[in-house]
């Protein structure tokens, strides 16, 4: 994990109000009772900061110890700081919990850059602004780490929401969400609305502002506009999906669709950027450069290193293209597309130039481990992780940042043939050789 890249995002003040709307008629297939409607107690339960992650408040132990926990759909361990660390304001103190049980087993998680290690146990866990339940869950008590916690990020642990297959030390360690569903009547589904501010926030603004919502067990109508479109979860490990086509300003990249999913495509709230396989990244950047050719930017900008600044309020959004990803639909030979704006893929950066400037980093980057639809994508959409039906839904987020000319979009259906051929089949290897890092 390279936190500057792998951990998400700016939170913040979205454009549209987040107040609840009345449920309305849609053309979607009917859902079973209890899965839809109003989840007022969970709306606005996320906070965060640019590039540093969205977090939810959780309590652990008896009596309850309150911690802020990073919401990460790209991993499967519930792990919390459990020893003093210079970047932690607080940490889980197992000795103070009467309900803590030691599993007498260690866990070690190395990343591309950095690592954490700790001791496994179980304890009682609840989410104050979530379902009114308490569950006994596995907890990795982090005793040692390197380049994992982020100074000033305000979170003390990580909630891995993906599947057991990628849990550490192995798939026998039940992830938190599996425990929640097994032990309660919470439906096997959660949804995320991550709200990018569109401008950098300082620490006090982050604490006072909305970062978004994690709706556990359902879908809240107030958080999206238009219809939800679903793509199948290809395999239950990461939240793996299949991209069948990519367009820049409506121009097809015209690559073999296998390239878009080489070696996988995942939806990951724990990654800041939209990360693309090398060949796809190079083609996409070439196309974005061509579309924005009235202005030129240094190579370091396209590499996500240098910042580009404009006088406050003069960012030329119009010269940058929209990016559309077509995802496999639920119906044979049918796809739909999600479209993001430069307001999503140019990430506001704070504290670098004067207050008279708006500065940005290019938040699309190269990957050697497949496509990662990180916060750059998720900030445009309300994303439903429908585990029960093995599918992920996308709708336009009510809080996405846009301008008067363009908006993020979810549109379909489109006819796309041979979509199954777009998936890449990873050669089976010994699990111990799998790469943990998502840098």
């Amino acid at each position: 994990t390279q936190h500057g890249i792998r951990l998400p995002l700016r939170s913040g003040l979205g454009g549209a109000p987040l107040g609840l709307r009345l449920p309305r008629e849609t053309d979607e297939e009917p859902e079973e009772p209890g899965r839809r409607g109003s989840f007022v107690e969970m709306v606005d339960n996320l906070r965060g900061k640019s590039g540093q992650g969205y977090y939810v408040e959780m309590t652990v132990g008896s009596p309850p110890q309150t911690l802020n926990i990073l919401v990460d759909t790209g991993s499967s361990n519930f792990a919390v700081g459990a020893a003093p660390h210079p970047f932690l304001h607080r940490y889980y103190q197992r000795q103070l919990s009467s309900t803590y049980r030691d599993l007498r087993k260690g866990v070690y998680v190395p990343y591309t850059q950095g690592k954490w290690e700790g001791e496994l146990g179980t304890d009682l866990v609840s989410i104050p602004h979530g379902p009114n339940v308490t569950v006994r869950a596995n907890i990795a008590a982090i005793t040692e780490s390197d380049k994992f916690f982020i100074n000033g990020s305000n979170w003390e642990g990580i909630l891995g929401l993906a599947y057991a297959e990628i849990a550490r030390p192995d798939d026998s360690l039940e992830p938190f969400f599996d425990s929640l569903v097994k032990q309660t009547h919470v439906p096997n589904l959660f949804s995320l609305q991550l709200c990018g501010a569109g401008f950098p926030l300082n620490q006090s603004e982050v604490l006072a502002s909305v970062g978004g919502s994690m709706i556990i067990g359902g879908i809240d109508h107030s958080l999206y506009t238009g219809s939800l479109w679903y793509t199948p979860i290809r395999r239950e490990w990461y939240y793996e999906v299949i991209i069948v086509r990519v367009e820049i300003n409506g121009q097809d990249l015209k690559m073999d669709c296998k390239e878009y999913n080489y070696d996988k495509s995942i939806v990951d709230s724990g990654t800041t950027n939209l990360r693309l396989p090398k060949k796809v990244f190079e083609a996409a950047v070439k196309s974005i450069k061509a579309a924005s050719s009235t202005e030129k930017f240094p190579d370091g900008f396209w590499l996500g290193e240098q910042l580009v600044c404009w006088q406050a309020g003069t960012t030329p959004w119009n010269i940058f293209p929209v990016i559309s990803l077509y995802l496999m639909g639920e119906v044979t030979n049918q796809s739909f597309r999600i479209t993001i704006l430069p307001q999503q893929y140019l990430r506001p950066v704070e504290d670098v130039a004067t207050s008279q400037d708006d500065c940005y980093k290019f938040a699309i980057s190269q990957s050697s481990t497949g496509t990662v639809m990180g916060a750059v994508i998720m900030e445009g959409f309300y994303v439903v992780f429908d585990r029960a039906r093995k599918r992920i839904g996308f709708a336009v987020s009510a809080c996405h940042v846009h301008d008067e000319f363009r908006t993020a979009a979810v549109e379909g259906p489109f006819v796309t043939l041979d979509m199954e051929d777009c998936g890449y089949n990873i050669p089976q290897t010994d699990e111990s050789t799998l790469m943990t890092g998502r840098a």
């Epitope: 202005e295 030129k296 240094p298 370091g300 290193e305 240098q306 670098v352 500065c359």
Partner: antibody, heavy 120, light 108 residues
Amino acid sequence: QLQLQESGPGLVKPSETLSLTCTVSGGSISWSSYYWSWIRQPPGKGLEWIGNIYYSGSTYYNPSLKSRVTISVDTSKNQFSLKLSSVTAADTAVYYCARLGHGYNYFDLWGRGTLVTVSS
Amino acid sequence: EIVLTQSPATLSLSPGERATLSCRASQSVSSYLAWFQQKPGQAPRLLIYDASNRATGIPARFSGSGSGTDFTLTISSLEPEDFAVYYCQQVYVWPPRTFGGGTKVEIK
């Protein structure tokens, strides 16, 4: 080889507009590999970036000068120009035009500079 | 705003001596830093770009190092023509705008 040459009045009255032109010779101002820049240096002091222009006309200005600065390009004459309005004695400086090269990052070629004095 | 602080303000050395000039950024600029030389009555000349790459035609006695916030320009053995003012400039924030205050290298 490419050369840059500044030209314009050496004396400007307070409250008036300073106008300078930079002529590019030995190459085309329309090369896509470069921005063209103005930088100034008050007597005995350090360097201050004023702004850049691309041959397409796209401009970037120093926020502290933005309200008074206009940079324009004339590709037919292979020239780019600086206008700085409402000048005061604090605008007295040697004004340099420069090429922003090395991937649009570094001022790799400079004119010799021209001293502009603001005085009545 | 990123501020570049150069030290010392003045460096008094003799020809043949080694000169070490420092440039410190108020926050990381990665390796996006340049060094310029300016002689009296002349325009600045690019010496080093990307912290350590010599520009075309610059003698090997000039070298740059550093990344992040701390950078150094070294002149291994001063020649008479090297006595001048040296400026650093960051381009981490683009367009390039911030220069250091300069270090004057004078004959002792």
